[in-house]
């Protein structure tokens, strides 16, 4: 394989490395109160935390990025914590033809990795 | 749709926002000199730059993240610049049975977005 194995233990201490965290947001927070009817509050899972060398590397590119960041930190950024998968969520909203249901596949993160 | 349209013009000035940049790297830089034979130097396209509000948002989640970062910057990180797609690259490397060609699909970035 083109890379060392990504590591899963956080060298920075508990809760500091890339992980999933729940953020409460109202429709007002999101600017959606004029068109979304329900839910009125969302539990949004988001990816937060740092990406130390080889921690939860998304792929070969992320491993290279981590290595080159160590060599050229001003030129190559460290990998960052982004969703690896999503949980679909249904929203009820207003449309011109009435109340409509729509499933969003890319709204709530389900897992995170360093890319 | 669940979000405003992502914008493509960088409000921070030329070259400051999320974009693709070429980084030269040798096999030694990558720690691959003991097993990769060719190429001896790689032109690695990587994603660099900032992700200001709604710039090249990857999806609905990224748009929400940008909005909540504006409201709760200590709790929600800004979106960051990561690959949206990759260019496959062929490496020639040593194996127990001789020289082998292998295509890596996730090594060189082809496009970038803010996730």
């Amino acid at each position: 394989s083109a890379h060392a194995h990504p590591r899963d233990s956080c060298p920075l201490g508990p809760g500091r490395c890339c992980h999933l965290e729940t953020v409460q947001a109202t429709l007002e927070d999101l600017g959606w109160s004029d068109w979304v009817l329900s839910p009125r509050q969302l539990q949004l899972s988001m990816c937060v935390g740092e990406c130390p060398h080889l921690y939860r590397s998304a792929n070969t590119h992320a491993q290279i990025k981590a290595r080159l960041h160590g060599l050229q930190p001003d030129k190559v950024p460290a990998p960052c914590c982004v969703p690896s998968s999503y949980t679909p969520v249904v929203l009820m909203h207003r449309t011109d033809s009435g109340v409509s249901l729509q499933t969003y596949d890319d709204l709530v993160a389900r897992g995170c990795h360093c890319a | 749709s669940a979000h405003a349209h992502p914008r493509d013009s960088c409000p921070l000035g030329p070259g400051r926002c999320c974009h693709l940049e070429t980084v030269q790297a040798t096999l030694e830089d990558l720690g691959w000199s003991d097993w990769v034979l060719s190429p001896r130097q790689l032109q690695l396209s990587m994603c660099v730059g900032e992700c200001p509000h709604l710039y090249r948002s990857a999806n609905t989640h990224a748009q929400i993240k940008a909005r909540l970062h504006g409201l709760q910057p200590d709790k929600v990180p800004a979106p960051c610049c990561v690959p949206s797609s990759y260019t496959p690259v062929v490496l020639m490397h040593r194996t127990d049975s001789g020289v082998s060609l292998q295509t890596y699909d996730d090594l060189v970035a082809r496009g970038c977005h803010c996730a």
Epitope: L37, S38, P39, T87, T103, V108 | -
Partner: antibody, heavy 118, light 108 residues
Framework: QVTLKESGPGILQPSQTLSLTCSFS??????????VSWIRQPSGKGLEWLAL???????RYNPSLKSRLTISKDASSNQVFLKITSVDTADTATYYC??????????WGQGTLVTVSA | EIVLTQSPALMAASPGEKVTITCSVS???????LHWYQQKSETSPKPWIY???NLASGVPVRFSGSGSGTSYSLTISSMEAEDAATYYC?????????FGAGTKLELK
């Protein structure tokens, strides 16, 4: 296109257990916010909510019947089940299965008539 | 539990007439938690109005809903034959979820 179809025994005797199945398509019960409810309606009468199950397996029951009701789901096969124990003639009704996203009875099945008779 | 009282229980209206059905709630609820459903004989109920005033998809614009607190209403600006049905109000403010007894609207 969302569809829900209820199936049940049609007729059963007092004291037996009523088992109802709701088979649905056009949505997933693995989607956040999605739920499925059961509501019944005796002939010529009003609507009575029985139970509700959400995507995260949160279950809600009508307290007046709670001791007799069990709702469950098989999200992978798109089915929801309701069991009512110790039925009597007052349980004779049309039973509806309803797609219930967040806080609304959005799509209703055609209903299945259940008759409890000695 | 929250009790919903509809009135009238039965009414008849002529084509073109304005119709108002009321729903009184035993304790104050948020307007976003009061819904209406329409049922025609021998068919399943249909969602009609969500959150007091938002028409379900396909509901004619002659229908409207209003209210707050403990008092809600459904209004038809101009009765048409296809509007003859039973209308139920329902609350989603607290469990158990409850319905009004229904208002049967007939064509005169």
């Amino acid at each position: 296109q969302v569809t829900l179809k209820e199936s049940g025994p049609g007729i059963l005797q007092p004291s037996q257990t009523l088992s109802l199945t709701c088979s649905f398509s056009g949505f997933s019960l693995s989607t956040s916010g999605m739920g499925v409810s059961w509501i019944r309606q005796p002939s010529g009468k009003g609507l009575e909510w029985l139970a509700l199950i959400y995507w995260d397996d949160d279950k809600r029951y009508n307290p007046s019947l709670k001791s007799r009701l069990t709702i469950s789901k098989d999200a992978s096969s798109n089915q929801v089940f309701l069991k009512i124990t110790s039925v009597d003639t007052a349980d004779t009704a049309t039973y509806y299965c309803i797609q219930s996203p967040w806080d609304w009875f959005a799509y209703w099945g055609q209903g299945t008539l259940v008759t409890v008779s000695a | 539990e929250i009790v919903l009282t509809q009135s009238p229980a039965l009414m008849a209206a002529s084509p073109g007439e304005k119709v108002t059905i009321t729903c009184s709630v035993s304790s104050s609820i948020s307007s976003s938690n009061l819904h209406w459903y329409q049922q025609k004989s021998e068919t399943s109920p249909k969602p009609w109005i969500y959150g007091t005033s938002n028409l379900a998809s396909g509901v004619p614009v002659r229908f409207s809903g209003s209210g707050s607190g403990t008092s809600y209403s459904l209004t038809i600006s101009s009765m048409e034959a296809e509007d003859a049905a039973t209308y139920y109000c329902q609350q989603w403010s607290s469990y158990p979820l409850t319905f009004g007894a229904g208002t049967k609207l007939e064509l005169k």
